[in-house]
């Protein structure tokens, strides 16, 4: 299924503190699932993989094709 590469951003994007475990976002994740379709503006974000939207963070992340790594699946995995 490829490698899942998430941004290192915490749930803090939508909370008062970067380390805070925000109840609102946790509830949102449970209700709607952890991922949703990426907004259209991120159509070309993932270079060698597919984009998904992290609901709790409201940010895109990439699921890399086999043999690729990196936040945007932009690097060849030399160990693959």
């Amino acid at each position: 299924d490829g490698n899942s590469t998430r941004s290192p951003e915490t749930n803090g994007l939508l909370c008062g503190d970067p380390e805070e475990n925000c109840a609102a976002t946790t509830t949102q994740s449970k209700r709607k699932g952890h991922f949703s379709r990426c907004p259209k503006q991120y159509k070309h974000y993932c270079i060698k993989g597919r984009c998904r939207f992290v609901v709790a963070e409201q940010t895109p992340s990439c699921v890399c094709d086999e043999g690729y790594i990196g936040a945007r699946c932009e690097r060849v995995d030399l160990f693959y």
Epitope: S7, P8, E9, T10, G12, L13, L14, P18, Q28, K32, S36, R37, P39, K40, Q41, Y45, V55, Q58, T59, P60, A71, R72, E74
Partner: antibody, heavy 116, light 106 residues
Framework: QVQLLESGGGLVQPGGSLRLSCAAS????????ISWVRQAPGKGLEWVSH????????LYADSVKGRFTISRDNSKNTLYLQMNSLRAEDTAVYYC?????????WGQGTLVTVSS | DIQMTQSPSSLSASVGDRVTITCRAS??????LGWYQQKPGKAPKLLIY???SLQSGVPSRFSGSGSGTDFTLTISSLQPEDFATYYC????????FGQGTKVEIK
């Protein structure tokens, strides 16, 4: 606490250039997408550009594409906006804001005035 | 580009009133919508994200609803500190804001 502090605004002639900076503190800067949003005097909000957490992805509003460049230096916790070929319609308060899609923290803004 | 149309552009209300602001997208944006409050001379403040989720620290009198093209921000009981301008923002195709709704004291 989270703080974003913009600087670099001022008066510039049409066709001129300006570089804005945004100093971030109170959070792990390198973990966040950051954006520039502007507001012309007495007008509404207009998103300008955003950059991902490591600086490998940028996106721009059509109104500034080809003239403005967003960048960041994670070692300095600083965001930049290089503005070239400035026009009168670029006159606005420029805010840096945390996030790429949604903006949960904003700076106080810096005023850019483009006039001859 | 996706256009965001807010209505009304301004409204007068009294403390304790229930206030509703609507935002319409020119095309479907699923639930990729946020609401902001801005007071004169200040930066905007995020109230609602993903159309209906309350941002941390925002009073529960604020609520959002809608999906697709039609969205609503409701203030259940207007407080003195709520007099401000409110903006919707879509984040599906690029990021665009509505023109704003100014909530004034009646």
């Amino acid at each position: 606490q989270v703080q974003l502090l913009e600087s670099g605004g001022g008066l510039v002639q049409p066709g001129g250039s300006l570089r804005l900076s945004c100093a971030a503190s109170g959070f792990t800067f390198s973990r966040y997408w950051i954006s520039w949003v502007r507001q012309a005097p007495g007008k509404g909000l207009e998103w300008v550009s955003h950059i991902n957490y490591e600086g490998t992805w940028t996106l721009y509003a059509d109104s500034v594409k080809g003239r403005f460049t967003i960048s960041r230096d994670n070692s300095k916790n600083t965001l930049y906006l290089q503005m070239n070929s400035l026009r009168a319609e670029d006159t606005a308060v420029y805010y840096c804001a945390r996030g790429g899609s949604l903006f949960d923290y904003w700076g106080q803004g810096t005023l850019v005035t483009v006039s001859s | 580009d996706i256009q965001m149309t807010q209505s009304p552009s301004s409204l007068s209300a009294s403390v304790g009133d229930r206030v509703t602001i609507t935002c319409r997208a020119s095309q479907g944006i699923i639930s990729y919508l946020g609401w902001y409050q801005q007071k004169p001379g200040k930066a905007p403040k995020l109230l609602i994200y993903a159309a209906s989720s309350l941002q941390s620290g925002v009073p529960s009198r604020f609520s959002g609803s809608g999906s697709g093209t039609d969205f609503t921000l409701t203030i259940s009981s207007l407080q003195p500190e709520d007099f401000a301008t409110y903006y919707c923002q879509q984040y599906d195709a690029l990021n665009t804001f509505g023109q704003g709704t100014k909530v004034e004291i009646k």
